[in-house]
Interface confidence: low
């Protein structure tokens, strides 16, 4: 019987992975080194696939080796000591001027030279750039660019505001109609804010004593209904408003004489006035019942050369009368006159005139109030420093509004280098038919009320206080104090502002740059104005445009519109 | 901490006025928003009106012929006035700083 | 006036349900919307205000949502001391009003 020979020579088993050979009867066995396996230990182990231990246990790359395998790490990355795990290079340490004069960011493999909003990274110089957006045609009117921004403007005095998209511009529109249907038989005595508004003469025979019977509305106080004077200015008579009662100055070679009388006529209500020259008096009547009867010597104006020539100014005189007058008038008037009947000669050739020209009509129906019609502006010259006020200077400030348009600048102040340290201003809000109330320094808004319904025929409330420490905003749902720390870089600008002159705007802005303040509209719409407990009448304003009425405020456009002789003045206010 | 205390008549007579008095104490009438409401029998709250801090008002039009509110900054106390009451008025009248804080409300019923 | 429409009128839940209070405005008010609880015998007390901000010392259980002019007051788990009546409030324009109230009670 042959010997069976050693199976294990010459050896069966793949050299590289096994680890022993065994020798059996006919037959061997490999025994494998980790790493291998087969019948031979033929076959390498790919370890990063094996289903037990996925990735072979790498936190990143798993490399296969022959009867092996290693861990390897990405880029920007190296691996920890036990020899599985990555951990990240944080190259902005390790080179610390890599990005120059841009901040370095460290992210995961890499690192990025970060760059402000508005900036752009230049590699050669390794350091940010502004980026022009105004270049690249970013705005549909007006763009300013900034460094690190730019902000679009459209030109709020023309009637537009910047679009929710902050580029585009679209019309402020109207959010509360109103009734502005005037009649060209009503005369609007406060077409001008400085000047007379009619002017008539009349030459009739000498036996014509003065006479003017006019229907009369309004709801100021004080100012000039009427001024008739004779050809050589030696005579003359006032018809005057004040303290809402009528007054009568008149002069003449024989006298000089004051009057007030009668009861209380600025109620927003037609109230018929007749002015009446008798032999020896002067008859005043309100509803046709003498208020007063003023004596006289002899006749009112002399008749030369047999007639008496007059001459008649409505809602005004000519300027070197003022210094005439017994007691001065500001002569400013807000109201209207219908039916009049001067000197009895009816009310024939006036209506001529007023027909054509459309500002000297009245509108059919007014309430209480001031109105700005979204072209022009209010000036005041206001004294804000209180020596009793440790603070030094305040800003209390009460707005009644009933807004018609919901963009618009309510109060600024400007001081003389064109800017504006403070603004009050309103803009639609995103939410639908509301608004918010915008306060502003400058060009910053400090403080914004949120979706508030304005819009409405009720008026609305708002009290601010300002001083150089804090801004307190009073609104019913409640009491907003923003501090000088929140606030003390724009309360600083505020308060350097106050220091010089300051003029204060009402219903908008004097020609100040469109970048000067985040609104630029005009306000429209009714509002009242309180400032440190002083009720701004815009008959005293240093300037007013003529289209401000100071002393009535249109309706809420109504389907079905009050006739002139209905006139229910009402006042819906948070007062 | 903010408190207040409703009083006044619980029984007022139809045509008369109705009179309320709010005490505050733990904060002063001179800032903030200082409220009227009211709780009819069938659970139906009403907004009535406001003083401010500065001592401006603002009524509910549904009431703003016959209401009144006034203050007393010296005794901190703020009041109310309802003018030619009816049965209707009978409710629970609260004072309210804002509406975070609220008296516990008074009952005021209105019969002849 | 904006009407603000509450409901259900009346609710009956067993402790450690959860619950759903609506309240529907005539009208859209922004996010302008205040929710009270008013216990028996007790003053109305704030939950949450403009429409979902939790108020100090009130339980996170109570949470609110909506926007516009549909609102929805819930309470995650009532307890017993959830019972009582629930208003909604408008501020959106004046005069602020309330709604009818939910009755929440003890089934």
């Known amino acids: 019987v042959n010997a069976i020979p050693d199976q294990c020579s010459p050896l069966p088993c793949n050299e590289d992975g096994y680890m022993s050979c065994k020798d059996g009867k006919a037959s061997f066995t490999c025994t494998c080194k980790p790493g291998w396996q087969g019948e031979k230990c033929e076959f390498d182990i790919n370890e990063c696939k094996d289903p037990s231990n996925i990735n072979g246990g790498c936190s990143q790359i798993c490399d296969n080796t022959p009867g092996s395998y290693h861990c390897s790490c990405k880029s920007g990355f190296v691996m920890l000591s036990n020899k599985k795990d990555c951990k990240d290079v944080d190259e902005c340490s390790l080179k610390p001027n890599m990005c120059g004069t841009a901040v370095c960011k460290n992210i995961p493999g890499d690192f990025e030279c970060e760059c402000p909003e508005g900036y752009r990274y230049n590699l050669k110089s390794k350091s940010c750039e502004d980026v022009d957006e105004c270049s690249e045609n970013m705005c549909a009117q007006l763009c300013v660019n900034y460094p690190g921004g730019y902000t679009c403007y459209c030109d709020g005095k023309k009637g537009f505001k910047l679009a929710q998209d902050q580029k585009s511009c679209e019309a402020v529109s109207v959010c509360l109609p109103l009734n502005l249907d005037t009649k060209y038989e009503l005369l609007y005595l406060a077409e001008q804010f400085a000047g007379v508004v009619l002017y008539l003469k009349f030459r009739l025979p000498e036996i014509s004593r003065f006479s003017a019977e006019f229907d009369f509305r309004t709801y100021d106080s004080q100012g000039v209904i009427l001024y008739a004077e004779s050809i050589d200015h030696s005579a003359w008579l006032l018809i005057a408003l004040r303290g809402g009662k009528i007054e009568v100055q008149l002069k003449n070679e024989h006298t000089s004489k004051i009057t007030t009388g009668g009861d209380i006529i600025n109620n927003g209500l037609w109230n018929m006035v007749s002015v009446e020259e008798l032999e020896h008096s002067i008859s005043i009547k309100i509803a046709k019942e003498a208020v007063m009867d003023i004596n006289k010597p002899g006749p009112l104006f002399k008749p030369e050369n047999g007639l008496l020539e007059t001459k008649v100014y409505f809602a005004g005189f000519p300027r070197k009368v003022e210094s005439e007058l017994i007691k001065p008038i500001n002569p400013r008037l807000d109201g209207c006159i219908r039916s009049w009947n001067l000197m009895k000669q009816g009310a024939s050739g006036i209506k001529e005139i007023i027909q054509e020209k459309q500002n000297k009509h009245c509108l059919v129906t007014v309430e209480k109030g001031s109105y700005y019609p979204g072209s022009g502006i209010a000036e005041f010259h206001i004294d804000y420093n209180n020596g009793s006020n440790a603070e030094g200077w305040h800003i209390n400030v009460t707005l009644n509004i009933r807004p018609s348009m919901g963009t618009g600048v309510m109060l600024a102040l400007v001081s003389s280098n064109n800017t504006v340290p403070f603004a009050v201003s309103l803009v639609d809000s995103t939410s639908e038919k509301s608004q918010d109330i915008v306060i502003s320094v400058e060009n910053t808004v400090i403080y914004r009320i949120q979706a508030l319904s304005l819009c409405s025929n009720q008026r609305s409330h708002l009290e601010f206080r300002v001083n150089r420490n804090n801004l307190e905003l009073l609104t019913p749902l409640k009491i907003e104090t923003i501090s000088q720390e929140e606030l003390q870089t724009q309360l600083a600008i505020l308060d350097k502002a106050m220091k010089g002159k300051v003029a204060t705007y009402l219903g908008g802005l004097p020609d100040v740059p469109f970048s000067a303040t985040p609104v630029n509209a005009f306000y429209n719409g009714c509002m009242e104005v309180n400032i440190n407990g002083v009720e701004l009448d815009l008959d005293e304003a240093i300037s007013k445009h003529n289209d401000i009425r100071a002393h009535s405020c249109p309706s809420v456009w109504k389907k079905t519109k009050n006739s002139e002789d209905q006139v229910d003045p009402r006042l819906i206010d948070g007062k | 901490e903010v408190q207040l205390q409703e009083s006044g008549p619980s029984l007022v007579k139809p045509s008369q006025t109705l009179s309320l008095t709010c005490s505050v104490t733990?904060?002063?009438?001179?800032?903030?928003?200082w409220n009227w409401i009211r709780k009819f029998p069938g659970n139906k709250l009403e907004y009535m009106g406001y003083?401010?801090?500065?001592?401006?008002?603002y009524y509910n039009p549904s009431l703003k012929s016959r209401i009144s509110i006034t203050r007393d900054t010296s005794k901190n106390q703020y009041y109310l006035q309802l003018n030619s009451v009816t049965t209707e008025d009978t409710a629970t009248y609260y004072c309210?700083?804002?509406?975070?804080?609220w008296g516990q409300g008074t009952l005021v019923t209105v019969s002849a | 006036d904006i009407v603000l429409t509450q409901s259900p009128a009346t609710l009956s839940v067993t402790p450690g349900d959860s619950v759903s209070l609506s309240c529907r405005a005539s009208?859209?008010?922004?996010?302008?919307l205040h929710w009270y609880q008013q216990k028996s015998h007790e003053s109305p007390r704030l939950l949450i205000k403009?429409?979902?901000q939790s108020i100090s010392g009130i339980p996170s259980r109570f949470s609110g949502s909506g926007s516009g002019t549909d609102f929805t007051l819930s309470i995650n788990s009532v307890e017993t001391e959830d019972f009582g009546m629930y208003f909604c409030?408008?501020?959106?324009?004046?005069?602020?009003?309330f709604g009818g109230g939910t009755k929440l009670e003890i089934k």
């Open positions: 309210a700083r804002e509406f975070a804080y």
């Open positions: 733990g904060d002063s009438i001179t800032s903030g928003y």
């Open positions: 003083i401010s801090f500065s001592g401006s008002t």
């Open positions: 009208q859209s008010i922004s996010n302008n």
């Open positions: 403009f429409v979902s």
């Open positions: 409030q408008q501020s959106n324009s004046w005069p602020w009003t």
